[in-house]
């Protein structure tokens, strides 16, 4: 099943997030992703856990997953590079870089997103944008068109409370509020964008969604700048 959902959000304006990618397995949406360079998409490492021998591709320039759009194009993946420290049983280092079979054709609906290199926490309360094609309600309805939600960043101390994530949120992770509006498994790999810059990637650990005591967890890309640069080099 697809890993992800946007809960309590609404349909995004078409092609207003030209960095947005759909990581697909055998032609179906699996995870979100974000174009960070002409030939590279950043996603979550856990997304490929279920991929096995399936065909992984990346859809760029899409708003609707099913409807024809002039900007839409499906790319094969030349290689998949999960973070070397990512492990199936933890949310740590949950990053994956996918090299496209060729450089993406850039245009108004396909553009890389600048990513944060300064390793500093986003201020609590900052409103950030998350988008994805994950299910939109607890009944499991999958949207055809991209959804988005605006979420406030939550301070790490609160997120690490025993009633919340109980110390699991390291300095390389960040949290956003999850009170009815939330990202979830199905949006794994998708971007958390603050101030026009990629700050976080939706982690793909399983957790309850839309519950304020279980905030959304995002991998801080700035904390992995050296690794990203080394792979893209």
């Amino acid at each position: 099943p697809p890993r992800g959902r946007i809960l309590g959000g609404r349909e995004a304006e078409a092609h207003a997030r030209p960095y947005m990618a759909s990581v697909q397995l055998n032609g179906a949406h699996l995870c979100g992703g974000v174009l960070v360079a002409e030939q590279w998409v950043l996603s979550a490492a856990h997304c490929l856990e279920d991929a096995a021998d399936g065909k992984v591709q990346v859809l760029l320039g899409a708003h609707s997953l099913s409807q024809p759009e002039p900007s839409k194009r499906l790319y094969d993946v030349l290689r998949a590079v999960p973070h070397p420290d990512s492990q199936p049983d933890t949310i740590d280092h949950d990053l994956l870089l996918l090299q496209l079979s060729e450089k993406a054709t850039l245009g108004p609906a396909v553009r890389p997103l600048p990513w944060q290199r300064v390793d500093r926490d986003v201020a609590p309360g900052t409103l950030c944008d998350v988008a994805g094609w994950g299910i939109v309600n607890h009944a499991g309805r999958r949207p055809d068109s991209l959804q988005h939600v605006l979420l406030p960043v939550l301070d790490r101390a609160t997120c690490n409370r025993r009633t919340h994530h109980d110390g699991a949120i390291t300095e390389r992770l960040m949290c956003a509020e999850s009170n009815r509006r939330d990202s979830c498994k199905g949006d794994s790999g998708g971007p958390l964008v603050c101030g026009g810059v990629l700050e976080g990637v939706v982690t793909s650990g399983s957790r309850v969604c839309g519950n304020r005591k279980k905030p959304g967890i995002y991998t801080r890309v700035a904390s992995y700048a050296a690794w990203i640069d080394s792979v893209l080099a």
Epitope: E13, P108, L113, D129, V193, G196
Partner: antibody, heavy 117, light 112 residues
Amino acid sequence: QVQLQQSAAELARPGASVKMSCKASGYTFTDYTMHWVKQRPGQGLEWIGYINPSGGYTDYNQKFKDKTALTADKSSSTAYMQLSSLTSEDSAVYYCARRRDYWFAYWGQGTLVTVSA
Amino acid sequence: DIVMSQSPSSLAVSVGEKVTMSCKSSQSLLYSGNQKNYLAWYQQKPGQSPKLLIYWASTRESGVPDRFTGSGSGTDFTLTISSVKAEDLAVYYCHQYYSYLTFGAGTKLELK
């Protein structure tokens, strides 16, 4: 109903900067991009770029990339455009506009910028 | 970028007359996947902001009088006003949204 209210006319010296505003009402500000369009006196329309107020993402017409900076304040539902290093070529009416689907269905009333020594 | 060329640049008409103006694009605006032309028309009266008239090349915006008709496909498009009224005197712009947004230079409709 959707309304875009732009700031008053600006008179500026060559080399100076101006910052104009566009206050949106009648819809959820963070759900739509805000675009900016330039119109020189007696001339046609030129697309400058847009900001997505939700995440702050911006995209520019390459011609205007070094000239303009687009920002947005979610708390006041206001988009801003700053023009820098002004020359007489920047004298124009600047419109903010909002799309409905792919086309511009809503326009501000325009802000006239006059650059003169 | 896609270049939009409008002709004529100005047009002198009498009230009640039928007028047509042309817009040509440097590449096709027709997407075969949905058979839609990514083109809009706007009207701009003196001292006012542009107003949307037509989108998808031929779909009239709500509230726009039916004397305004958009037609054409691919690279050649036409805006027709079946019987011009004095209030139609304005500049008309075509606009493509197939790729990076560009506008034509406009056709000015004036009284003879």
